[in-house]
């Protein structure tokens, strides 16, 4: 049953004289193993014999023996699956039909395979994509319907006869579906590859040429342009003429439109291959190119930089930074459009040339107030000298300078006067906006920079002011030199150091703490009576009569100041003692008689002693001696003695007469 045999193999195999053929082949004999195999060349069925006639290239028998002449052909198969064959070498006359006669126990089959052997190696075939565009990667394929294990070959790519640098990937197929060798080359064609010949060359293992295929590249690309300019350096002066020509060196497909661009912007009404610029101005400086389009897209030429040279334009000055603070650094930049760029600069400050400053930038490392003003510059190039522009103003800011505190009053200033001071300065930038004063006080500022001190104190010594803008500058303090009457006048005892005793030498000092002016006069006074005009008041031998309330006065040209009253106390022993009797020195018996010891003493008498006419001390120690009732025998002379811390004093005798009462006389 023929349907039971299933074969798979390439339909036709290709080779050339001297090469080899490898025939991949599989089969399936469903009724059992293969028992006999014969390979025929161009088999023909003989109906008479019911057998195939033809050249037998290979024959296998049941005992597996193969005739020696059949070594050229090899059956590489097996008894149930594989029917692969190899013919090595293959000859031209091997072309035709190969017949595989297969016999199993019960079935037979003839499988036919076509073999095409050429006299010389046949060429490979180059396959190209339908369209090639510049810079787009394409894959070139070189295909050869040949591959054989016993005959190695290689495929090499050439461009215009020169091996291509790109690495090709070669693959082979020896399968029941196909037999081929293929080389694939990835390649990014440039416009310059258009029309170039690409070759795929078949070589043997030694690199010997066998055959090739060639194709001409058709690379689609935008127009390729060349721009030519007169003059060739594209450097002209204002008023000159310039011609630019656009040449198309290649375009595939043909170009359709032409235009010109300046600095990337299309120039209107310029649609020819020549651009004529007459009497150019500096504004026409720039980058020019031509643009030509085809179906692929627009192509642009290289840019031509047209330089229209001109003398420097009026310059401007840029200041970094204004306003500037005194002591900071400042940079000036001279800006002037010119072509070529200026080579020399002249700088001016307030109209005067700044010597030695010839560069685009001027640097002042430490700004001073007199750097303020207008800075201008002039730029110069080979075509001429520009004009001086308006310049830029440098504002130099600094604290108020030379600040002084000025006393507006006529001198001298007296304590209690109203003093007016002003805060003056030489210059300031920005303007002074406020003032400060030291020391602080509850003082009036009637106007900016003026200080009014009402009722100036004697101790207002110095005042300083500051004038302030963004900074404060302090003046040196000014002395008010306030004049005042002597202060803190007081009486001070110089000697003796202890209490004053009658007879002592005594000195009193008139002290004061301060006086301005310093020249002073002194006056001593007791009970409104002038005693002296020296700073000291001296007593050679003080007496109790000198005790009392003393004041001293100190005066200067401003006024006089009195001390507080000072009490002078003289200590002395009891004196001027006398015994006084009450109600009198004649008293009737039985009545009351009081004897008083009167004295003058400082300190007062602390202890009294009474004596009778016999100089007998009496047992009484108080100032008063009371006799009640008085007796006649009390009559007699009495005296007293007073004692204080200084000493003792005694009185003269005083006689008390006690007379009888009428009753006593009546009784007698």
């Amino acid at each position: 049953d023929s349907s039971k045999w299933v074969f798979e193999h390439p339909e036709t195999l290709y080779a050339w004289e001297g090469a080899c053929v490898w025939i991949p082949c599989t089969y399936r004999a469903l009724d059992g193993d293969l028992e006999s195999f014969i390979l025929f060349h161009n088999p023909e069925y003989n109906k008479n014999t019911s057998k195939f006639d033809g050249t037998r290239l290979y024959e296998s028998t049941k005992d597996g023996k193969v005739p020696s002449e059949q070594k050229r052909v090899q059956f590489l198969g097996d008894k149930n699956k594989n029917c692969t064959l190899s013919i090595h070498p293959v000859h031209l006359n091997d072309s035709g039909q190969l017949g595989l006669r297969m016999e199993s126990k019960t079935e037979k089959w003839m499988e036919r395979i076509h073999l095409n052997v050429s006299e010389r190696p046949f060429p490979p075939h180059i396959q190209l994509p339908p369209e090639i565009q510049e810079s787009q990667e394409v894959t070139l394929t070189c295909l050869l319907n040949f591959s054989c294990y016993g005959y190695p070959i290689q495929l090499q790519w050439l461009l215009e006869g020169v091996p291509m640098r790109q690495a090709a990937v070669t693959s082979t197929s020896l399968t029941i579906k196909s037999v081929f060798t293929r080389s694939e080359l990835k390649f990014s064609p440039q416009w310059s590859h258009h029309g170039k010949i690409v070759t795929c060359q078949l070589q043997d293992a030694d690199g010997k040429f066998l055959s090739n295929d060639t194709v001409q590249l058709n690379v689609k690309h935008t127009p390729k342009l060349e721009i030519k300019v007169t003059p060739s350096d594209a450097i002209v002066r204002e008023g000159d003429s310039v011609t630019m020509t656009c040449e198309v060196s290649s375009s595939n497909p043909e170009y359709t439109t032409v235009s010109w661009l300046k600095d990337g912007t299309s120039l209107k009404k310029q649609n020819t291959f020549t651009l004529n610029l007459r009497e150019v101005t500096k504004d026409q400086s720039g980058k020019y190119c031509c643009q030509v389009s085809n179906d692929v897209g627009p192509g642009r030429s290289e840019e031509v930089f047209l330089q229209v040279q001109y003398a420097p334009e009026p310059s401007t000055v840029q200041i970094l930074h204004s306003p500037a603070v005194e002591g900071s650094q400042v940079e000036f930049l001279c800006m002037s459009l010119a072509n070529p760029l200026p080579t020399n600069y002249t700088w001016y400050h307030n109209g005067k040339e700044m010597q030695g400053r010839t560069e685009e930038k001027v640097h002042i490392p430490k700004i001073l107030p007199w750097h303020a003003g207008t800075y201008s510059c002039v730029a110069e190039n080979i075509l001429g000298t520009g004009q001086r522009g308006p310049g830029a103003e440098l504002d130099v800011q600094y604290p108020p300078k030379k600040v002084t505190t000025v006393i507006q009053n006529p001198m001298p200033i007296r304590e209690g006067d109203t003093v007016t001071l002003s805060c003056n300065y030489n210059s300031s930038n920005p303007s002074v906006t406020r003032y400060e004063w030291k020391p602080h006080g509850a003082w009036e500022e009637p106007s900016l920079g003026v200080l009014k001190i009402q009722n100036v104190g004697w101790d207002n010594t110095t005042i300083a002011c500051a004038a302030c803008n963004s900074w404060c500058s302090w003046a040196s303090p000014v002395a008010l030199n306030v004049q005042y009457a002597p202060r803190d006048v007081r009486v001070r005892k110089i000697k003796p150091l202890s209490e004053i005793h009658s007879g002592n030498s005594v000195s009193l000092q008139c002290d004061f703490s301060s006086s301005h002016p310093k020249e002073v006069q002194f006056f001593w006074e007791k009970n409104g009576r002038l005693l002296g005009k020296e700073s000291q008041l001296n007593f050679d031998s003080i007496s109790p009569e000198d005790a009392g309330s003393y004041s001293c006065w100190v005066n200067n040209s401003i006024g006089q100041t009195a001390s507080k009253a000072w009490t002078l106390e003289v200590l002395y022993a009891p004196r001027r003692l006398r015994v006084s009797m009450s109600p009198g020195d004649q008293v009737m018996e039985g009545k009351s008689a009081t004897l008083t010891c009167e004295s003058d003493a400082n300190p007062p008498v602390s202890h009294y002693t009474w004596f009778d006419w016999n100089n007998q001390s009496l047992p009484y120690h108080s100032q008063k001696l009371r006799l009640e009732p008085v007796k006649v025998q009390h009559s007699g002379a009495y005296w007293c003695q007073g004692t204080n811390s200084v000493g003792k004093g005694r009185s003269p005798l005083s006689t008390l007469t006690v007379y009888y009462s009428p009753e006593t006389i009546g009784r007698r």
Epitope: G356, T358, I364, P365, K366, K402
Partner: antibody, heavy 117, light 107 residues
Framework: EVQLEESGPGLVAPSQSLSITCTVS????????ISWIRQPPGKGLEWLGV???????NYNSAFMSRLSISRDNSKSQVFLKMNSLQTDDTAIYYC???????????WGQGTSVTVSS | DIVMTQSSSYLSVSLGGRVTITCKAS??????LAWYQQKPGNAPRLLIS???SLETGVPSRFSGSGSGKDYTLSITSLQTEDVATYYC?????????FGSGTKLEIK
């Protein structure tokens, strides 16, 4: 710290030339002008010339024909060269720093030059 | 060239006193005037620039004034360390010129 230091030969023979180097530190020669000033013994100060920040020079007309000032920015040095020295060129030579609008704020210590055979 | 004239070559002043040194320019110098102090054996030292601007570190007893062509350096309360020669210099235009100097001595 700003410093200027002059180095000179000390003794020069009459009719010979004088070369002095001023080496500066603490500032750049492209930011400050350098002047040369001399002071004969017991006499006053005399300005000889200046090297401006931009590299230009200016000379006292009395010395124009025999004076040249140059500099080497990379070494921070300014050079004075004076030809045809006579005995009355004996002086202390100072290099000093200034800038536009400023006075001469820093002076070298001076180098003493004696012209004698 | 602008000529700078210092009328006094020598000045003798008492300690603590006030001294005024004058300098006259042959042309207007727009206040671009400097004063220098030179002590024996030393390089000059800048005291005042721009006619009035006191350099940092210079005692406040030094002051400058003037305008146009006439300029003054004042020292109040003279100290022993102020004994020196004082030079004026114009920095208005080249050649920069100096005054002949005023030597200050203590009386």
């Amino acid at each position: 710290e700003v410093q200027l230091e002059e180095s000179g030969p000390g003794l020069v023979a009459p009719s010979q030339s004088l070369s002095i180097t001023c080496t500066v530190s603490g500032f750049s020669l492209t930011r400050y002008d350098i002047s040369w000033i001399r002071q004969p013994p017991g006499k006053g100060l005399e300005w000889l010339g200046v090297m401006w920040t931009g590299g230009g020079t200016n000379y006292n007309s009395a010395f124009m024909s025999r004076l040249s000032i140059s500099r080497d920015n990379s070494k921070s040095q300014v050079f004075l060269k004076m030809n045809s020295l006579q005995t009355d060129d004996t002086a202390i030579y100072y290099c000093v720093r200034s800038y536009y609008g400023s006075a001469m704020d820093y002076w070298g210590q001076g180098t003493s030059v004696t012209v004698s055979s | 060239d602008i000529v700078m004239t210092q009328s006094s070559s020598y000045l003798s002043v008492s300690l603590g006193g006030r001294v005024t040194i004058t300098c006259k320019a042959s042309d207007h110098i727009n206040n671009w005037l400097a004063w220098y102090q030179q002590k024996p054996g030393n390089a000059p030292r800048l005291l005042i620039s721009g006619a009035t601007s006191l350099e940092t570190g210079v005692p406040s007893r030094f002051s400058g004034s003037g305008s146009g062509k006439d300029y003054t350096l004042s020292i109040t309360s003279l100290q022993t360390e102020d004994v020196a020669t004082y030079y004026c210099q114009q920095h208005w235009s080249t050649p920069f010129t100096f005054g002949s100097g005023t030597k200050l001595e203590i009386k």
